[in-house]
Structure formats: C-alpha cells, structure tokens
Amino acid sequence: LPAQVAFTPYAPEPGSTCRLREYYDQTAQMCCSKCSPGQHAKVFCTKTSDTVCDSCEDSTYTQLWNWVPECLSCGSRCSSDQVETQACTREQNRICTCRPGWYCALSKQEGCRLCAPLRKCRPGFGVARPGTETSDVVCKPCAPGTFSNTTSSTDICRPHQICNVVAIPGNASMDAVCTSTSPTRSMAPGAVHLPQPVSTRSQHTQPTPEPSTAPSTSFLLPMGPSPPAEGSTGD
C-alpha cells in the first residue's frame, strides 16, 4: 500500500527531514509549509495550524521559498548614470548595471561598486571576446589576411579585400588597396560590430590584457598594477 501523504503541519519521523518546500519549526516541532517567492510568513505555524503567508509589500521581495517574517527591501533606485536591467518586483530585487560602454569591475552585495570603461582595441587589434556586464573586452592581434583600422570596443578583425591587382598590400591595421580595376571580392562596407551584451551575468576569467586604449583596471587586483602589455597605450 502507498504510504499515506502527510499534510502540513505534521511531526516528522525521528531522523527524517521535512519535504521540499517545507521547513522544521523549532517551536511547534512540526514540518510546516514555506511561503512561495513573492510572499513571507505572516503567522508561523503551530501544532494545529499551518504557516499563513502574505504577499510582499511594494518595494520589497522574496526570491526563494521561505519562512521569513518580513520581505527584503529592494535596493535603492538606480542612479541616473546606471541602467535598470531588472525592476524591483515581489519576487526579485532590482538590478542596476553600468552605462553602455562600461562594465562592473568591482561588485558589492547591492550591485556594482565600481564601473570601468570597456577596453578599446587599437588599430591592428580586434575584439576576441566582447565585454559583458561584469567582464572587460579582450583584444587580439589581427591575423595575417585580416585587419582593423578602428579604435573600438566592438569591432572585430575583418578580412582584407581580394584584389585582381594589388596597389598597396593590406596589413593588420589597413585594408588592401586595389588598382583601379575592381576587386574580385570585397567585404561589405563599414566595420563589423559585435553586439553589446545586455544581460550576460557570467564572470569570465581574464587572460593577460591585450593592447588597448582603455585604462587598466589592474589596480583592483591585490598584487597591484602590472606594466602595460606590449603595444598598449599608457595613460
């Protein structure tokens, strides 16, 4: 026969734990229901009555199943120089992120502690990995046959155009120049951009910084500033 399903509140068997979305109330010595995200415990359970839950008030939230007496306060409104990427709701705190072109170099409990400008890759270098909300751009030298002639935090290395007759060969920072006869194949005009991520939350491990024009954030590391990478522009 199937075991009888116990309804909360119930006394757990000795040595066993309460089920998912239940908690053990020390006072009542019973397994009781947790409140769902967006709610909090208005009245704790007793031996004869289950937890009474109530909705979080405005500007407060609970993100997890819980039995807290009061919901958590949402963080203060995003300052004018930050972007609200997640609003305060009954189930989630607001999230403020750095303005476009900047990333969070140092975080704190309530959000970002220090925003820093995204590294810009210099001519001859393209974006190997785009910046996210919490990680800087990684630049790489343009491989033979490719170039970047911009200082940008979004442009990747583009292939040289292929000429019937080359007037000036391309290099890492300049496209090939063809003679007046048209090239057999040319790339679409304009720089190739990598889209700026809006809500990437992952923190990448940073390889050694490549040449760039953005200021180094190495001052944030415990070991102190390191010398600029070869070919990078100093402050």
Epitope: D81, E110, L114, P117, T213, P215, T233
Partner: antibody
Framework: QVQLVQSGPEVKKPGASVKVSCKAS????????INWVRQAPGQGLEWMGW????????KYAEKFQGRVTLTVDTSSSTAYMELSSLRSEDTATYFC????????????WGQGTLVTVSS | DIQMTQSPSSLSASVGDRVTITCKAS??????VAWYQQKPGQSPKLLIY???TRHTGVPSRFSGSGSGTDYTLTISSLQPEDVATYYC?????????FGGGTKLEIK
C-alpha cells in the same frame, strides 16, 4: 541629511604622524566608498586614496603609497586617514568625500581639516 | 595618469555676463567629467557630472558640454554668489585627476 563631519585642525612637527577622522551620518556608511582628497594652500585638489567600509578594501595614489593608511570604524560610522613622516609640503586641508555610486566623482564632502606641518 | 588642463586660471566678469571655463584632457575620457564649485573657506560642491548632467539643486544657469578631450562649463548669467574657484575632474581612469582650477571674480 547626508553629512560627513571631520575632526579639527592639527599642528604637527616634521617626521610626525597625523590622524584625521570623518564621521558619516544620514546614510548607510558601509555601502559607499570614502575617498580622501587634499588641497595645499592656494593649490588644486589631489586624490589620495579610497576605502570601502564594508570590507576595509583600500587603494592609494602612488604618490602616497607607504605613507598613508585609511581605516574605518563601522560601529561609529567613522573613516580615518593617517599620514606619516610628515613634511612641510604636507601642509594642506584634507577632505573626505563620498562616492555617490559606481563612478569616481564625489557628491558629498566633509568640511575639511587643516593640517599644518611646521618645526 | 590623465592630465586635466584647465583655462583660464583666473577670470573677472560682470554680473549678468556669460562665462565659459574650459578643460582639456590628455586623452579621450568619454564624457566622464565632473565640475565642482569651491567657495573660499568651503569644501568643493558637485555641480555637473557626465560632462553635462546637473547635480540635484544646481541652478539651471550652470551647464556643461563636451566630448572626447574637450569640456566646457558655462554660467549663462553670472550672479554675485558664483564667485568661487571651479575645478574639472576626470573619472574615466584611476587615479581620478583634477584640473588646476579657475578662480572667478566679479568685476
């Protein structure tokens, strides 16, 4: 309202140390970085360093590295700036200033503390 | 470190005049520029951040503009209470650095 109140003026001899305090009120002290900026008489403003009260994490300007120590006492919401091996050129008004958010500009300043170094 | 070169170092103007103070950064600072007003014997007061955003409570006669390396603070109609030294500051990179200041007097 948000306020930073600094300790009174100090007169010190060359080679001595000075410790200036900055008491915060009207906001959550541990949530905002406190910076120290100095101004020599008739001169411009010079950033010295910062401290994050929640973790005690510090960063100093290269010029002051090894001579300046920033600390906090979270129980009294007070930040301290200690400058050692004083010389006459350290005669200046020292300001504490708060970062309003994650960018390095200062929205609230203390009234300043004049430190005079003279033999 | 990024250098901020402010000009002029001092200027004298009449009440009602339009006053312009300029600041040049040694490299592109992407509008990460703040302006402060410091009256004699007082601490600096934030006027403008992000080159053109007025701080809370700052009168509308104060405005900021600029991009790249060149930034300007403008007082559209000078008032007697505007007598002060004005400083620009970049916060694009650490350490934050200030201009040398512009001392503004009334003629």
């Amino acid at each position: 309202q948000v306020q930073l109140v600094q300790s009174g003026p100090e007169v010190k001899k060359p080679g001595a140390s000075v410790k200036v305090s900055c008491k915060a009120s009207g906001y959550s002290f541990t949530s905002y970085d406190i910076n120290w900026v100095r101004q020599a008489p008739g001169q411009g403003l010079e950033w010295m360093g910062w401290i994050y009260p929640r973790e005690g994490d510090t960063k100093y300007a290269e010029k002051f590295q090894g001579r300046v120590t920033l600390t906090v006492d979270t129980s009294s919401s007070t930040a301290y700036m200690e400058l050692s091996s004083l010389r006459s050129e350290d005669t200046a008004t020292y300001f504490c200033a708060r970062l309003t958010g994650p960018y390095w500009y200062f929205d609230v300043w203390g009234q300043g503390t004049l430190v005079t170094v003279s033999s | 470190d990024i250098q901020m070169t402010q000009s002029p170092s001092s200027l004298s103007a009449s009440v009602g005049d339009r006053v312009t103070i300029t600041c040049k950064a040694s490299q592109d600072v992407d509008t990460a520029v703040a302006w402060y007003q410091q009256k004699p014997g007082q601490s600096p007061k934030l006027l403008i951040y992000w080159a053109s955003t007025r701080h809370t409570g700052v009168p509308s006669r104060f405005s900021g503009s600029g991009s790249g390396t060149d930034y300007t603070l403008t007082i559209s109609s000078l008032q007697p209470e505007d007598v002060a030294t004005y400083y620009c500051q970049q916060y694009y990179s650490v350490p934050p650095t200030f201009g040398g200041g512009t001392k503004l007097e009334i003629k």
